[in-house]
Amino acid sequence: FVRTKIDTTENLLNTEVHSSPAQRWSMQVPPEVSAEAGDAAVLPCTFTHPHRHYDGPLTAIWRAGEPYAGPQVFRCAAARGSELCQTALSLHGRFRLLGNPRRNDLSLRVERLALADDRRYFCRVEFAGDVHDRYESRHGVRLHVTAAPRIVNISVLPSPAHAFRALCTAEGEPPPALAWSGPALGNSLAAVRSPREGHGHLVTAELPALTHDGRYTCTAANSLGRSEASVYLFRFHGASGAST
């Protein structure tokens, strides 16, 4: 299931003397497309241009992150007169052109979405040959990837003075709320660290001092689901070691 916000248009005038107001470079992309991790999403992009009946070589490009300079994730090229845009680059083989660039459509399908795909994407078309021109969406389309929580790490670590602390890291979008439960704890939200920079979908919760032996469970929950994982603490009493 994919949700697309209402289209906005990037209408940009081309200053070529021979181009009338009706024939100008513009790109139509929605501001945002939402889809769940594991699913596929379609990034729509259509364009208009001032070069009537252009049938020369063309290249269609999608890049991520920022316009003009972000890394390419997809590129295909169509020879003069050809409707087939041959893929030259598809990052991890997950990007596929749905549209026909000859018909002013650069729409892209992204398969097997992951949270790391949550970023802004920019479509671009380049004409080569007799006419040589290019244009890229400057605002792009934000791909918003949602995901049920997944606990990626749970561990018990030594603390000063022979104490122990527990850490739980989960990912999800929206970022999940984390709670710890365990001996003499009840349900505790614990010290939740904000998502780390560059790891926007990761949340960590810490139990600073484990006072009792037994099973400690971390629960991660967001609007799409919940996940839990447990860790066991057993200290050898009379010794300074512990088994987890």
Epitope: T15, T59, A88, A128, Y135, E136, R138
Partner: antibody
């Protein structure tokens, strides 16, 4: 760090051929157009040729069309310029450059001198 | 071909003073709003050219903010405030709008 390193040029007689190459590193080679720009002794910069991402499209300045061939090997991250029927006016330092379109000729090699003389 | 005309051909500047270089194109380099294909390069003596400014006014990576580009359509200016000894060299404007891609003839900056 982006690096572009041209091969050695040299002295060549008029009418003869020479091939220049440029080894690139520090960026995703196939994501960019590449170009050759030359500079005659004590003169300004003159664009020579450009090649598209997958070598599907090449552009040349009129004075070298039919004599020079620009090519690239994305697997080896190398750019080449085959120069045939060389003339004395082709004498120049040749630079390979990464052509970023909206970002200009963003990175340049150190340059290699080609002298065409009998 | 688009002709890029630079003025002056050379200028001599006192350290700490400002310098201004003009570049005029024979055709508008405005492709669409916010997208103008004009660039400035500096070639220091015995070195390769280096990108200074892209798309009229954007500073390239590592370029000090003493350099400022401005202009539109056919008239462009590179201004260097507080000129330093290391700024000597030849400054070129260039266009990437149309093939053949062209450069100005260069402006030589010297320190008094």
């Amino acid at each position: 760090e982006v690096q572009l390193v041209e091969s050695d040029g040299g002295l060549v007689q008029p009418g003869r051929s020479l091939k220049l190459s440029c080894a690139a590193s520090g960026f995703t080679f196939s994501d960019y157009y590449l170009a050759w720009v030359r500079q005659a002794p004590t003169k300004g910069l003159e664009w020579v040729a450009s090649v598209s991402y997958d070598a599907i499209t090449n552009y040349y300045r009129d004075s070298v069309k039919g004599r020079f061939t620009i090519s690239r090997d994305n697997a080896k991250s190398t750019l080449s310029l085959q120069m045939d029927s060389l003339r004395s006016e082709d004498t120049a330092t040749y630079y390979c450059a990464r052509q970023d379109w909206e970002g200009g000729f963003a990175y340049w090699g150190q340059g290699t001198l080609v002298t065409v003389s009998s | 071909d688009i002709v890029m005309t630079q003025t002056p051909l050379s200028l001599s500047v006192t350290p700490g003073a400002s310098a201004s270089i003009s570049c005029r194109s024979s055709k508008s380099l405005l492709h669409s709003p916010g997208l103008t294909y004009v660039f400035w390069y500096l070639q220091k003596p015995g070195r390769s050219p280096r990108l200074l400014i892209y798309r009229v006014s954007n500073l390239a990576s590592g370029v000090p903010d003493r350099f400022r580009g401005s202009g539109s359509e056919t008239d462009f200016t590179l201004k260097i405030s507080r000129v330093e000894a290391e700024d000597v060299g030849i400054y070129y404007c260039g266009q990437l709008l149309e093939n053949p891609f062209t450069f100005g003839s260069g402006t030589k900056l010297e320190i008094k």
